[in-house]
């Protein structure tokens, strides 16, 4: 650590005195202190001399000697008072800038330590300090306003009692800056704008910050617009608003608009797009396939996206058949607005019944006209199977009818014993019917197919089973010939005699 001579913490001299401060260290040393007149600095290796032969009150201050090469950063200090009867204060700065909640040091240094008992801090023109101003005083450093607030941005003077009268320092302006968390907050409204040529439009760009020092501008396709700025202060924030009013829009007004605000912390920008169209428009679309297939008993939501300007004057969902004249319940229809010009309309169809298959149409209207979007809903069913014994052209034939959607495939099985359902161990023979005859196939209905199995002789201790399957499920019917005649078994049902 460097050593200062004279080796005292404080030195009191009179104006005009010669002052010599010497600092010695192991390596090179540096003096530092407040800017003040008349000092001569002389450095010689490991020592440095700070001297004046005409000390004034302005030399009052703390002088510190450091050793730049010292890794511990040690330093020594001495405080010099130049005791001037006419000048109790040496003010080192006429403006102090701090952030809110920092301590603000007003650097009026007392030139005579004896005066410490009679010092006070006041606002200029003798006005008292604001309430709740918490401050302390150090003769070496001045007055400290603790946890300074923005409202304490004022002009202050330091006061000392000399011979029964108050002697004021020159004033010190305190600027307490709001802590700026980041660039100004921005809003640009609307987020999107559509107008028909000739209509009026308004775009509002506004920025706000806790500090007044920020800039805001609106630009159109990278061209800065000259717009008068409105300023305001409320909720402890400064606001600057730019309003672009267009009485009759044309195509050249279309394009990208950016609202940009900047301060010392950086820049924020937000953009919107302005579209100018020749006439009203109404577009309907869906992300879903317009042809829907759903298993009976399940639910379905039909969604339509609407893009329109001007806004919709009417809309509804309609059931177009073919099964009944019922209409969708209004409570199952839902509308959500994605933004000003785009909406989503949803029709919820829970636990679909056979009679609800068919066409559903969404209709919407605006000044541009009517538009419709139609969905076709087909229900899927697992196959239902039945088998009968009959004679065709004199031959004994098993006839299997299967009904379901999608169209079922048919497989015949012959197995030993009497059973409701052939299992693998019992199977004697398997026939696939690749092309069963389609008996009926109408839109939105089940498909019914028929498969024939010609049997020369029915084996009485055997079972003949017709199995049908599709993507939804499967069904089967077991036919059991008995001595009294041919019997059939639907799955999980009692034997019966036709």
């Amino acid at each position: 650590i460097p050593v200062i001579e004279p080796s005292v913490p404080e030195l009191v001299v009179k104006p005009g005195a010669t002052v010599t401060l010497r600092c010695v260290g192991n390596g090179s040393v540096e003096w530092d202190g407040p800017p003040s007149p008349h000092w001569t600095l002389y450095s010689d290796g490991s020592s440095s001399i700070l001297s004046t032969n005409n000390a004034t009150f302005q030399n009052t201050g703390t002088y510190r000697c450091t050793e730049p090469g010292d890794p511990l950063g040690g330093s020594a200090a001495i405080h010099l008072y130049v005791k001037d009867p006419a000048r109790p204060w040496n003010v080192l700065a006429q403006e102090v800038v701090v952030f809110e909640d920092q301590d603000a040091l007003l650097p009026c240094l007392l030139t005579d330590p004896v005066l410490e008992a009679g010092v006070s801090l006041v606002r200029v023109r003798g006005r008292p300090l604001m309430r709740h101003t918490n401050y302390s005083f150090s003769p070496w450093h001045g007055f400290t306003i603790h946890r300074a607030k923005f409202i304490q941005s004022q002009d202050y003077q330091c006061s000392a009692l000399m011979g029964g009268r108050k002697v004021m320092s020159i004033s010190i302006r305190l600027k307490v800056q709001k802590v700026i968390p980041g660039p100004p907050a921005l809003t640009l409204v609307p987020a999107e704008l559509v107008r028909i040529r000739g209509e009026a439009a308004q775009i509002v760009c506004s920025a706000s910050s806790v500090d007044v020092n920020f800039d805001v501008f609106l630009q159109h396709n990278n061209t800065k617009l000259a717009i008068p700025q409105q300023s305001d202060f409320h909720n402890n924030r400064y606001q600057k608003v730019l309003t672009l009013n267009l009485d009759q829009v044309d195509f050249q007004h279309a394009g990208n608009y950016s609202c940009v605000a900047s301060n010392v912390q950086g820049k924020h920008s937000t953009s919107m797009f302005f579209r100018v169209v020749e006439s009203a428009y109404l577009n309907l679309s869906s992300e879903q396939n317009l042809i829907q297939e759903v298993t009976v008993g399940e639910g379905l939501n039909l969604k339509v996206m609407v893009e329109a300007y001007p806004g919709l004057q009417g809309f509804n969902w309609t059931y177009l058949g073919p099964f009944s004249d019922h209409q969708p319940e209004p409570k199952l229809a839902n509308a959500t607005t994605k933004d000003t010009y785009r909406h989503t309309f949803t029709l919820s169809l829970p636990r679909l019944k056979p009679s609800e298959a068919g066409r559903y149409s969404f209709l919407a209207r605006n000044p541009g006209g009517w538009r419709a979007l139609t969905f076709e809903l087909t229900l899927r069913y697992p196959p239902e199977v039945s088998v009968i014994w009959t004679f065709i052209n004199g031959s004994g034939t098993l006839l299997c009818a299967a009904s379901g959607y999608p169209q079922p495939n048919v497989t015949w099985l012959q197995c030993s014993g009497h059973t409701d359902r052939c299992d693998e161990a019992q199977v004697l023979q398997v026939w696939d019917d690749p092309y069963p005859e389609v008996l009926s196939q109408e839109p939105f209905h089940k498909v019914t197919v028929q498969s024939l199995l010609t049997v020369e002789t029915l084996e009485h201790n055997q079972t003949y089973e017709c199995r049908a399957h599709n993507s939804v499920g499967s069904g089967s019917w077991a036919f059991i010939p008995i001595s009294a005649g041919a019997h059939t078994h639907p799955p999980d049902e009692f034997l019966f005699t036709p």
Partner: antibody, heavy 117, light 109 residues
Framework: QVQLQESGPGLVKPSETLSLTCTVS????????WSWIRQPPGKGLEWIGY???????NYNPSLKSRVTTSVDTSKNQFSLKLRSVTAADTAVYYC???????????WGQGTMVTVSS | SSELTQDPAVSVALGQTVRITCQGD??????ASWYQQKPGQAPILVIY???NRPSGIPDRFSGSSSGNTASLTITGAQAEDEADYYC????????????FGRGTKLTVL
């Protein structure tokens, strides 16, 4: 060894605010006075003002109405704000360490700021 | 506030001695500091206080003061000394304000 580094935008539009930051490395900002000095192209040096770690400031009278300097000891940085700039504020801006008001013994390398629309 | 006056340009033959001067009322109370600046570079402190050289500054640079005039002397000027030289001091208002001279362009012939 103490080093100074200026940073900030190189282009500022007329009437806007010029904002620069000087980062002190290799030493503490909580000692010494720290100054801003500028030099217009082809011209001499002009002192703008200084700031002390406590927030004390002093400014060139010709710029005082437009200047604010401040210090952030936690980041070891001090900054300059010059409001309502014009083309006449186009210059290389330097930050420097001030020793006792006697000399600027350490300088940043300078940053060119152009004021133009 | 005070002004500091410098000659705009001075030239010196290689190896010769040259004196650059700075005049101003504030120099009666304050010593001047001197800075060397080469094109495209930041200024460098060469002399401060009564006659102090920062480390790394050759001893051919020296400073002196008399009345309201401060002088920077280069004894045995070298080609690398060609640069602009600026003086500065506090002004005499007592408000700790800083003033610079307008600079002297030194040419080494």
């Amino acid at each position: 060894q103490v080093q100074l580094q200026e940073s900030g935008p190189g282009l500022v539009k007329p009437s806007e605010t010029l904002s620069l930051t000087c980062t002190v490395s290799g030493g503490s900002i909580s000692s010494y006075y720290w100054s801003w000095i500028r030099q217009p192209p082809g011209k001499g040096l002009e002192w703008i003002g200084y700031v002390y770690y406590s927030g004390s400031t002093n400014y060139n009278p010709s710029l005082k109405s437009r200047v604010t300097t401040s210090v952030d000891t936690s980041k070891n940085q001090f900054s300059l704000k010059l409001r309502s700039v014009t083309a006449a504020d186009t210059a290389v801006y330097y930050c420097a360490r001030d020793r006792l008001g006697i000399a600027f013994d350490i300088w940043g390398q300078g940053t060119m700021v152009t004021v133009s629309s | 506030s005070s002004e500091l006056t410098q000659d705009p340009a001075v030239s010196v033959a290689l190896g010769q001695t040259v004196r650059i001067t700075c005049q101003g009322d504030s120099l009666r109370s304050y010593y001047a500091s001197w800075y060397q600046q080469k094109p495209g570079q930041a200024p460098i402190l060469v002399i401060y206080g009564k006659n102090n050289r920062p480390s790394g500054i050759p001893d051919r640079f020296s400073g002196s003061s008399s009345g309201n005039t401060a002088s920077l002397t280069i004894t045995g000027a070298q080609a690398e000394d060609e640069a602009d030289y600026y003086c500065n001091s506090q002004d005499n208002s007592g408000n700790h304000l800083v003033v610079f001279g307008r600079g002297t362009k030194l040419t080494v012939l």
